[in-house]
């Protein structure tokens, strides 16, 4: 990210270039890779962030692959096609004309096919389960303190409406955060749970997307909460369509 002039920066997305080239010479920030102007008062969509990540200079790229135990998102990074709203296009293809369908968080939900593959609609991920294991501590965290701190984090740092944090479960050392957001519940201006989960995931990995802020310093009653493993599970409004071969593998 480049600060084009005083105060012409994007606090919520460091993967942008900002310039006083907006209407009337106002500051305008465009996402790397796509060139789309982003709203720096809220989170940038995961699709634009992935595209920016893939367009960054190769020596600055970090290939992060989820745990082998993750049920989904085990294809690693790819350079996605985003629609004019910044959402994932339902069908994604690579340079060799291999195509697949994705959900609203960009995770593959069908077998891979060729250019004839049809993805009729972008299926919404309405339930996200973030499964964390924290490093050993002297004692267990107080559940209600932990619950309050994580809810505060999603509300204040990621601007996610509290009603979309459905539950926080805790059985030491495992913490589970449930995010739920149906199409009908999401109003204009609401942060998408998929975007909030992605920002959280990057924060936990020490790869904050926020401009100029320190990394995530999670504390519960002053005690550091250090995460040593993260798994994220995605549930779609319509079940995925994988072949039996994959399901029995």
């Amino acid at each position: 990210h480049t600060a084009a002039q005083d105060n012409c920066t994007c606090p919520t997305n460091k993967m942008t270039v900002c310039s006083p080239d907006g209407p009337g010479g106002r500051c305008q920030c465009r996402a790397l890779g796509s060139g789309m102007a982003v709203d720096c008062s809220t989170l940038t969509s995961k699709c634009l962030l992935l595209k920016a990540r893939m367009s960054a200079p190769k020596n600055a790229r970090t290939l992060v692959r989820p745990s082998e135990h993750a049920l989904v998102d085990n294809d690693g990074l790819y350079d996605p096609d985003c629609d004019p709203e910044g959402r994932f296009k339902a069908r994604q293809c690579n340079q060799t004309s291999v195509c697949w369908c994705v959900n609203s968080v960009g995770v593959r939900r069908t077998d891979k096919g060729d250019l004839s593959l049809r993805c009729d609609e972008l299926v919404r991920t309405h339930h996200i389960l973030i499964d964390l294991r924290h490093r050993p501590t002297a004692g267990a965290f107080n559940h209600s303190d932990l619950d309050a701190e994580l809810r505060r984090l999603f509300r204040e740092r990621y601007r996610l409406h509290p009603k979309f944090v459905a539950a926080v479960h805790y059985e030491q050392p495992t913490i589970q955060i449930e995010l739920r957001q149906n199409t009908s519940q999401k109003a204009a201006g609401d942060v998408d749970i998929g975007d909030a989960a992605y920002y959280f995931e990057r924060d936990i990995k020490g790869e904050s997307l926020f401009q100029g802020r320190g990394g995530l310093d999670l504390r519960v009653r002053g005690e550091p909460l250090q995460v040593e493993r993260t798994l994220i599970y995605y549930l779609d409004e319509i079940p995925p369509k994988f072949s039996m071969k994959r399901l029995t593998a």
Partner: antibody, heavy 116, light 113 residues
């Protein structure tokens, strides 16, 4: 006032390379995107790519990848567009332009003729 | 890539006549974050670089005569010249600068009868 002044016309042989310059003045060169646009004889406009000189971020139109290289020298406020492996179909006028909503600033154009 | 399609390809009108040039994009150019349409209109005369007339679909660039106006949102846009003058003879282009690669319409040639 804002000005973009391009280098003069070029005549090149097929297979050669050419480097067109665009010198900016009247604004802070490093904080605006600068793009390159091609116009073949009697044809329309095609966006080739752009550069943000302050950080050297560059984007290319997929159609021109491998053909064009865009660079900038912030010390002289000059952007460059190099075309390689020239063919007759690369004969065109090449424009540089400051991008953005208030993007009314274009260079005068540089005619590149490829002929054996 | 976003495809920009202009209509008509050319038109010949009398001085003082009202002219409309249409531009249709294959995808929406409306940015939901700032409610801005990323569409510009340019005028190009022979041997000259394009001249910006309208940006943001409807904002007239400073110094552009008020007979030029732009309208539309999403995928359908219009450039209107309320009363054509002799100096308006040119080729007019619409351009999207919403998502890379930025793309232009094929151009509309305006002539005087």
């Amino acid at each position: 006032q804002v000005q973009l002044v391009q280098s003069g016309p070029e005549v090149k042989k097929p297979g050669a390379s050419v480097k067109v310059s665009c010198k900016a003045s009247g604004y802070t060169f490093t904080i605006y995107w600068l793009g390159w646009v091609r116009q073949a004889p009697g044809q329309g406009l095609e966006w080739m790519g752009n550069i943000f000189p302050g950080s050297a971020y560059i984007n290319y139109n997929e159609k021109f990848k491998g053909k064009v290289t865009i660079t900038a020298d912030t010390s002289t406020s000059t952007a460059y567009m190099e075309l390689s492996s020239l063919r007759s179909e690369d004969t065109a006028v090449y424009f540089c332009a400051r991008e953005g909503s208030n993007s009314g600033y274009w260079g005068q154009g540089t005619l590149v003729t490829v002929s054996s | 890539d976003i495809v920009m399609t202009q209509s008509p390809d050319s038109l010949a009108v009398s001085l003082g006549e009202r002219v409309t040039i249409n531009c249709k994009s294959s995808q929406s150019l409306l940015n939901s974050g700032n409610q801005q349409n990323y569409l510009a209109w340019y005028q190009q005369k022979p041997g000259q670089p394009p001249k910006l007339l309208i940006y943001g679909a409807s904002t007239r660039e400073s110094g552009v005569p008020d007979r030029f106006s732009g309208s539309g949102s999403g995928t359908d846009f219009t450039l209107t010249i309320s009363s054509v003058q002799a100096e308006d003879v040119a080729v007019y282009y619409c351009q999207s600068d919403h998502i890379y690669p930025y793309t232009f319409g094929q151009g509309t040639k305006l002539e005087i009868k």
